[in-house]
């Protein structure tokens, strides 16, 4: 959930040692306690629709709701992109889209969530039961990926709801190290705000630009009706790959993203999205990885934004998709 | 360093297939991707189309599907194309350019070019 | 597909000049635009990626700018050498595709 919290502008301390430590003490408090707020779980979204026109034509949907910068998402299919997973598509906000047959058409929906048109007939067609998955890496939440499919009974046209996608699994580096940092900023903010407790309260001046009080604004999808789930039956008769579920399967290395540039890229501004809001889903495999970004910030300046690829030594098997994605 | 080295030039009869090979080094195919372009003489550019190593899933413009196949040996880092069903409009220098990932998202290095000449 | 226009076919300068060639994209390819050099009998050498990042070992004379839809390659102090073709190309999207090139010529 995003989550932003509007801090006052402080009055300046008095001068001198203690006027110094006033400031330290107040200021602190308040950058924490904007961690916390602001510490939420991003979520991925997945979202499988039939076409009505063409049974073998599908649209995928995907969205990341969290606050931070996305860098690259990477559709796959036939499970998660580290579990024999297939790369259909390779979005990145600056530097271009890639898809690969049977993906027709990929595009940015919004500054987050991104469309995926597939079509074929034969091998390389998709069918009813088969599983996409989105992986969204961002800074600085990290990777998170989530997977949907059309449910066992449902007409073309009509579409699975989006997924949200909860942690499943996660990597202990982020879980552990982001969670540990905001757990100990939590604990020491209210360390800080009992040893205040008894003293006068600090003089607040409100920020020039938002005159009103301190306030946390929440933002959460709506939980829309949820009666898109039951559809009528439609029989389906393509042939197409197994879905390869496979949540017990780590990646088999880094991921070939691990250093992703530190700028914010201005990410594209698409058209509104489309109507429906992300809203829970039964039977949909989910699955979720949070990577933390360990090289982030080294390359030199004068190399321009870049992404450092990890080939796999393993051969074709191992670098399954294009770009190296497992 | 990166280096590309295509095949010699070809001579080919209307009708004929031609198959052009670039050569990569300083790098392994399965790390970038290989595209392909053509320039007619005096002409612009004309991309052809990408194949992904990694994937072996091939994009083609739309101008050259059924014209040209595009395929990878990953053993010995060669990348082909092939080109069927030949006719004069045909005739042309065909570059192999690396498809860079990492940084530029484009074609960065480039091979020299293949002459094709297709008469009668 | 996007189409990339360069509207100056040629465009003649003199040795120390400043010279501009712009491309305009038919819709928005954010910063995904390249820049290639083609002298007379060679293969294109790459010379900006990503609009405004020079590629290794190009002289700090050649600029790229630009972003969503108007690009533009600045090459200032001009010398002879640069007598070449000039391409953009767009690879926001698949089918990439090049401008229609413009050959600067030296005075």
């Known amino acids: 959930m995003r989550t932003e919290a509007q801090v006052p502008a402080l009055q300046p301390p008095e001068p001198g040692l203690e006027g110094a430590m006033g400031h330290r003490t107040l200021v602190l408090p308040w950058v924490l306690l904007t961690l916390c707020v602001t510490a939420g779980t991003p979520e991925v979204w997945v979202q499988v629709r039939m076409e009505a026109t063409e049974l073998s034509s599908f649209t995928i949907r995907c969205g990341f709701l969290g606050s931070g910068s996305i860098s690259l998402v990477t559709v796959s299919w036939g499970g998660p992109n580290g579990a024999g997973g297939t790369t259909l598509a390779v979005l990145h906000p600056e530097r271009g889209i890639r898809q690969w047959a049977p993906a027709r058409q990929a595009r940015w929906e919004t500054q987050s969530s991104i469309s995926l048109i597939l079509e074929g007939s034969g091998a390389s067609s998709p069918c009813a039961n088969t599983t996409f998955c989105c992986k969204f890496a961002s800074f600085p939440e990290g990777s998170w990926e989530a997977c949907g499919s059309l449910p066992p009974s449902s007409d073309p046209g009509l579409s699975a709801p989006p997924t949200p996608a909860p942690i499943l699994r996660a990597d202990l580096a982020g879980i552990l190290g982001v969670s540990g940092v905001l757990l100990f900023g939590c604990v020491y903010l209210l360390h800080l705000l009992r040893r205040h407790k008894h003293r006068p309260a600090p003089r607040l001046q409100p920020s020039r630009t938002s005159p009103q009080a301190p306030r946390a604004r929440a933002w959460a999808p709506s939980q829309a009706s949820q009666a898109a789930l039951h559809v009528p039956y439609a029989t389906i008769n393509t042939s197409c790959r197994p879905a390869t579920l496979d949540t017990a399967h780590p990646h088999g290395g880094p991921s070939w993203w691990a250093s992703l540039p530190t700028h914010a890229a201005h990410r594209p501004q698409g058209p509104a999205a489309w109507a429906s809001t992300p809203i829970p889903a039964r039977g949909s495999f989910v699955s979720v990885e949070n990577g933390l970004y360990a090289q982030a910030g080294e390359r030199p300046p004068h190399t321009g934004p870049g992404l450092t690829l990890f080939p796999d030594p393993r051969g074709p098997r191992a670098m399954e998709g294009p770009l190296g994605v497992r | 360093q990166v280096q590309l080295q295509q095949s010699g030039p070809e001579l080919a009869r209307p009708g004929a297939s031609v198959k052009l090979s670039c050569k990569a080094s300083?790098?392994?195919?399965?790390?970038?991707?290989i595209s392909w372009v053509k320039q007619r003489t005096g002409q612009g550019l004309e991309w052809i189309g990408e194949?992904?190593?990694?994937?072996?899933?091939?994009y083609y413009s739309e101008k050259f599907k059924g014209k040209a196949t595009l395929t990878a040996d990953k053993s010995s880092n060669i990348a082909y194309m092939q080109l069927s069903s030949l006719t004069s409009e045909d005739s042309a220098v065909y570059f192999c350019?690396?498809?860079?990932?990492?940084?530029?998202?484009?074609?960065?290095?480039w091979g020299q070019g293949t002459s094709v000449t297709v008469s009668s | 597909d996007i189409v990339m226009t360069q509207s100056q076919k040629c465009m003649s300068t003199s040795v120390g000049d400043r010279v501009s060639i712009t491309c305009k994209a038919s819709?928005?390819?954010?910063?995904?635009v390249a820049w290639y050099q083609q002298k007379p009998g060679q293969s294109p050498k790459t010379l900006i990626y990503?609009?405004?990042n020079r590629h290794t070992g190009v002289p700090d004379r050649f600029t790229g700018s630009g972003s969503g839809t108007d690009f533009t390659l600045t090459i200032t102090n001009v010398q002879s050498e640069d007598l070449a073709d000039y391409f953009c190309?767009?690879?926001?999207?698949?089918?990439?595709?090049f401008g229609g090139g413009t050959e600067l010529e030296i005075k």
């Open positions: 819709q928005n390819v954010r910063s995904a």
């Open positions: 350019a690396r498809s860079d990932y990492s940084d530029y998202w484009a074609m960065d290095y």
């Open positions: 190309l767009q690879h926001w999207n698949y089918p990439w595709t």
């Open positions: 300083g790098y392994t195919l399965t790390s970038h991707g």
């Open positions: 194949i992904y190593p990694g994937s072996e899933s091939p």
């Open positions: 990503l609009a405004s």
